[in-house]
Each structure stands twice: as C-alpha cells, then as structure tokens.
C-alpha cells in the first residue's frame, strides 16, 4: 500500500511513501521513513555546525547522499538543506561526516558561495555555502 | 520566459504611503528569494529589501528599516512592497528582482521594468 | 552593514582586456556577483559565485576573487561592453541582507 504524499513544504511536487511500517522503518515520530532510510526536514534555520549538532542529539546526521536509487525522493526536495558534506581543504577532497569521501557523479557540485560546507538541493546538486550561514537542514538516520 | 511585470509610476508627498507590486510569471515562484532593488535618478543601485520563498527569512538596508515591509502572495505569484513615511531621498526606480536561491542571497538574474516612484511636494 | 568599493571609471582599448575590481569585508566571506547595466536597460547578471556565467553570457567575460577583493575581467573588450558595471555580495552580517558596489562606468575607447 502506498500514500500519495504531498508535503509543499518539503518536494515540488506529490511523493509516493509507503503507509505501513513494515515496508520502511522504524524512525522516530513523525519522520520520513523511505527506502530503509528515516529522514527529517527541519525548518529552523541554524548554521552547519549547529544542524549537525541537532541531528546528533537525535541519534542522526545530517542528510549523507550514497545512492541515487535508494534515495529518488531527494529528486524532488524544494529549496536547499544542510547535508553532512564538509570541503577537506589539506587535500581538496568533500567528505561525508563519517569519514566517507563522496563518490564520483552522485553529487553535481556548484560553487555558490566561499566555503567549506555544502548544501543539498533537488535533482542531487550540492552548493557549496558558507558554513556559519543560518539556514533549514535535514536529519537522517539508517534503519539497517 | 520569466517575466517581472511591476505596478506603473506615481508620484507621493512626503510623509505619504505607496504599495508597489509585481506580478511573475514563466517560473516557479515559490522556488526563489525575490529582492526589491533601486536606483536614483544618475546614481547606482541600492538594495532596498529581500524575502525568502516561504517568506522565513526577510531582509532591510538600514535607510528603510522601521518604515517598508517586503511581503509577497505565492497563491497569486506576486510580490510586494509598502513604503510608508516617504522622504524625498527614496525617490528613484524600483526593481523587482528574483534571485538564484530559494532561502539565501545569491545573485539576481531577472529583474523587472522598474517602477519609477517620486516623492515630491 | 557592509560596504562594497569600486573604482568609479575605468577605461580599455578595443579588443584589449580590461579588469573592473570591487573591495569590501564582506568579500572576504563571500563571492560577488557581477552585473551590466546600460541606459536605460536594467541590469543584466553576467558572473556569480565562484565564475559561473548565465547562459547567454559570452565567455570573454569572467569573474575571480583574492582576500577582500572581488575582480571582473573582460578579455578582448567590444564596444557593446561599453555600460555601468555593479558588484554586489551578501552582506557580512550573514544575514538575508545583500549590498552592491557604487558602480564602474566602463569605456571602450
């Protein structure tokens, strides 16, 4: 059974997520759970340092991008997020919060803005902004 | 094509009020920051206000601050400006101007006609 | 608030290249963008972040940036270059608030 969800805050346009819990899950309460994965927008705005901060008090991170399969519903996210990628300026590398080094054409990498931090943007686009920049992020946690 | 279409010129007393508006078309409007921009007759540009899509983040320049208010209507793809206690320096043209970004300041890539607004006894 | 300094004319040679520079804290923090105006037109954008151009923006012009100074560079100038120019960046502050440079008016001799 799937619901056809349509969050105007969130995609530009309807998102199919499943109903029941035992396709996806289990996430915390009121969060997106899709694909093996729980995610969570939030609204306020706070600079990269203090989303990360965040989600970890929620026993997430921030949003790391490993999949453009897994994660299609990233396709259709409105406006721009705070993700886990931070620029590793000694060898030029970005790098996920875990330590992992992005892959190669997941992320199409736009350098906006001075920086060392990235924001998520639809149609898997990184823009590269300044991290002290306030600004709305997404949490999310793996359910395996 | 986008398109920023803005309200006609008009001429106020000091100490009056006015309501610019612009009406978009040919994008996403609730995708984007709009700005309002303006220009004194032979001077430069002077960034007067900005608003975020969701209207969450809303900016002022000092000269302006405590007398516009930025505003804009999704549902009717418009955006607007209230100017109240006019002073013959806020004379100029007024841009509408949309921005790169959804949330964040990047740089204006389509501007509108301007709005020719004089502020004269 | 902060406050973006340009040189208020500068002038090049026909087919010569011509640099127009922009100065202010804020720079440091953030990149410019760059924008044309002619009489009577409004402005047009042709550079923003690091030296991203909008289509229909020709390649000769491009854009960089070194501590607090933002530059413009026009290579191989034509005649239709010949306008006001404008820098303008977020404003130090890191707040929505943006500010613009007071204008160079380019000749092209």
């Known amino acids: 059974i799937w619901s056809a969800v349509f969050l105007n805050s969130l995609f530009n346009q309807e998102v199919q997520i499943p109903l029941t819990e035992s396709y996806c899950g289990p996430c915390p309460k009121n969060w997106i759970c899709y694909k093996n994965n729980c995610y969570q927008f939030f609204d306020e705005s706070k600079n990269w340092y203090e989303s990360q901060a965040s989600c970890m008090s929620q026993n997430a991170s921030l949003l790391k991008v490993y999949s453009k399969e897994d994660q299609d519903l990233l396709k259709l996210v409105k406006s721009y997020h705070w993700m886990g990628l931070v620029h590793i300026p000694t060898n030029g590398s970005w790098q996920w919060e875990d330590g992992s080094i992005l892959s190669p054409n997941l992320l199409t990498i736009i350098e906006m803005q001075k920086g060392d931090c990235a924001l998520y943007a639809s149609s898997f686009k990184g823009y590269i902004e300044n991290c002290s920049t306030p600004n709305t992020y997404i949490c999310m946690q793996r359910t395996v | 094509q986008v398109q920023l279409v803005q309200s006609g010129g008009v001429v106020v007393q000091p100490g009056g009020s006015l309501r610019l508006s612009c009406a978009a078309s040919?994008?996403?409007?609730?995708?984007?920051?709009m700005h309002w921009v303006r220009q004194a007759p032979g001077k430069g540009l002077e960034w007067v206000s900005g608003?975020?899509?969701?209207?969450?983040?809303?900016g002022y320049a000092d000269s302006v601050r405590g007398r516009f208010t930025i505003s804009r209507d999704n549902a009717k793809n418009s955006l607007f400006l209230q100017m109240n206690s006019l002073r013959a320096e806020d004379t100029a043209l007024y841009y509408c101007?949309?921005?790169?970004?959804?949330?964040?300041?990047?740089?204006?890539?389509?501007w509108g006609q301007g709005t020719l607004v004089t502020v004269s006894s | 608030s902060s406050e973006l300094t340009q040189d208020p004319a500068v002038s090049v040679a026909l087919g010569q290249t011509v640099r127009i520079t922009c100065q202010g804290d804020?720079?440091?923090?953030?990149?410019a963008s760059w924008y044309q105006q002619k009489p009577g037109q409004a402005p047009v954008l042709v550079i923003y972040?690091?030296?991203n151009r909008p289509s229909g923006i020709p390649d000769r012009f491009s854009g960089s940036s070194s501590g607090n100074t933002a530059s413009l560079t026009i290579t191989e100038a034509q005649a239709e270059d010949e306008a006001d120019y404008y820098c303008?960046?977020?404003?130090?502050?890191?707040?929505?608030?943006?500010?613009f440079g007071g204008g160079t008016k380019l000749t092209v001799l």
């Open positions: 303008n960046s977020r404003d130090s502050s890191g707040n929505h608030d943006m500010v």
């Open positions: 101007a949309k921005d790169l970004s959804a949330m964040l300041s990047w740089g204006i890539d389509y």
């Open positions: 804020s720079l440091r923090s953030y990149y």
């Open positions: 608003i975020s899509w969701n209207s969450n983040k809303i």
């Open positions: 972040g690091k030296n």
């Open positions: 040919g994008f996403t409007f609730d995708d984007y920051t």
